[in-house]
Amino acid sequence: AWELTILHTNDVHSRLEQTSEDSSKCVNASRCMGGVARLFTKVQQIRRAEPNVLLLDAGDQYQGTIWFTVYKGAEVAHFMNALRYDAMALGNHEFDNGVEGLIEPLLKEAKFPILSANIKAKGPLASQISGLYLPYKVLPVGDEVVGIVGYTSKETPFLSNPGTNLVFEDEITALQPEVDKLKTLNVNKIIALGHSGFEMDKLIAQKVRGVDVVVGGHSNTFLYTGNPPSKEVPAGKYPFIVTSDDGRKVPVVQAYAFGKYLGYLKIEFDERGNVISSHGNPILLNSSIPEDPSIKADINKWRIKLDNYSTQELGKTIVYLDGSSQSCRFRECNMGNLICDAMINNNLRHTDEMFWNHVSMCILNGGGIRSPIDERNNGTITWENLAAVLPFGGTFDLVQLKGSTLKKAFEHSVHRYGQSTGEFLQVGGIHVVYDLSRKPGDRVVKLDVLCTKCRVPSYDPLKMDEVYKVILPNFLANGGDGFQMIKDELLRHDSGDQDINVVSTYISKMKVIYPAVEGRIKFSTGSH
């Protein structure tokens, strides 16, 4: 028998520095977790103690903190090289800055293979990107070889910016021929490493003949055997065992997200490459594990540029950005309009000729807007200014909701109007009319939404049974500010980009902004 140790991360999302337990900014160092310096300590400890070790990443290193905003992926390549990762699968967020934003900082700089079998390049891109990412890689491990085959969510064109010259195929259809190829090369130990979510990971384990282990990402799934060490609630045991269609027991693993845990899986193979046993658990990277001093010193060196960035001008406003509670919790405010416009702009994806965009709607709780920005400061907008507007470190996510759920959300928005409460919704791609003379729960008298399946966008009445895509803060997706109906009834939830980053990118792109109050939210009395 031959034993392999698989160390794995996924959905690190730019958490290069240690974080607090909830993966936000570290405020009390003695209680902080994760970060590449601490990860390196643990990885090195295991490499020294065990003979056959692979360090793998299942995608979405990109996006999540100011590190990515400033360094644009160069930080990912640099620190993953320093940690000596053995392979990485492409995640959807690796395409957030377009294909160029993946090729230059990461694909060309990484000293480890970057994988995806179901992404096929076409047109002029095919030759440009050739060899920079691979469908699979055969890695020597001790006296043996292990095949790693990659995959990426086929939803990526809706979640990021891969452009029109990359085709995202069905994962299972694309993986099978690559695994078959590995078999013909006499590679009998095969790991599928990818970024499509736990449900797809399990399907791959079940359907793709020849895959021995699945290491996944995208769904931030926490698996654990025994008593979990922190707040994450396990979705199942680690590893999660799937019985394949050809009768094999295939371990499936994921390691939550944000570099909080290091996945640790021990696999025993027989001489024919069959899995005899698998066991392990994610390792919580808490403060009992010291940060490696040389990596920490490097982090501190790279940090300097971030501190300077906070006060640099991103763009200018020539109007007052009204983010006051007196406005944003009572009526349409232009800060709400700005943020919603940025949220939609961040999700522009021309993936289908029938649709001008896949999503047109944004909702945003007025209580999440915490500061105005005065244009009389030379119009300057900095990251620091935006951090005062959006101080809670959330993300702007993509959800799918029925029209009936949206209607309930808008009724909740004004069910106790006038008390300066945070649930009053700011909007984009939506025209809503409220009649406050009616009883709570029956105050929405008109709700029109911007079409997506159209060449000329126009507003149509909301249909109760139709499924709509909406961009909103993760706080609302999780039921915050009383929006329990969103949490309970959402049909799909994909986590998105850091809130401040979305707005800062938009302002940098527009250079000069002048959002208006333009009749997205209206109040009326009487009949309609």
């Epitope: 909830d22 936000s24 405020v27 009390n28 006051s324 509670s325 007196q326 999440g368 915490r370 500061s371 951090a387 005062a388 101080p391 809670f392 470190g393 959330g394 909740h412 008390q419 300066s420 993760n474 706080f475 999780n478 039921g479 915050g480 009383g482 329990q484």
Partner: antibody, heavy 117, light 105 residues
Framework: EVQLVESGGGLVQPGGSLRLSCAAS????????MHWVRQAPGKGLEWVAV????????YYADSVKGRFTISRDNSKNTLYLQMNSLRAEDTAVYYC??????????WGQGTLVTVSS | IQMTQSPSSLSASVGDRVTITCRAS??????LAWYQQKPGKAPKLLIY???TLQSGVPSRFSGSGSGTDFTLTISSLQPEDFATYYC????????FGQGTRLEIK
Amino acid sequence: EVQLVESGGGLVQPGGSLRLSCAASGFTFSSYDMHWVRQAPGKGLEWVAVMSYEGSNKYYADSVKGRFTISRDNSKNTLYLQMNSLRAEDTAVYYCATEIAAKGDYWGQGTLVTVSS
Amino acid sequence: IQMTQSPSSLSASVGDRVTITCRASQGISNYLAWYQQKPGKAPKLLIYAASTLQSGVPSRFSGSGSGTDFTLTISSLQPEDFATYYCQQSYSTPHFGQGTRLEIK
């Protein structure tokens, strides 16, 4: 590190006044609504007052309305509670706390106010 | 809005499953939090938005409910869980329940 440190507690006679302070550090104080909560010896928690992050809204428990005033100075990262016409039943440990936001809340360790003749 | 917690005290053993309930005098949607307090210490947030587990809180704690009836459940009591528990609504001006003292049997 996030810290809320209350001060200004002590012994005061019935009818007297005290001003409590709460010094905040380690987070964006000006972005959070702030509360005062108290706990009489051996009793449960009682909410006292709240002030919105930018200072435009203040609300009080009925038991302190007209006697207590909450205020804040965002430039000094400090929350205040001016307590007038104090009564024996105001004897308690007074805590300052942030609102529950997307990441939860923060509390101080409390300051003891004793109203006795 | 008044909050009524029950029971006011409870004896249980390590490993037990414990449930504490809280009833609001009128509907509060999911604007409900649960706190744990130990003698001489500030309260510690366990659950907010009725069912969202606060960072750093063990997963044996869970919250449920919406509207007027809410529940805090501890799936398997640990020695450090013996304390007083409070619910608090933040739908209107905040109000705490009277507390539930959880003691070792």
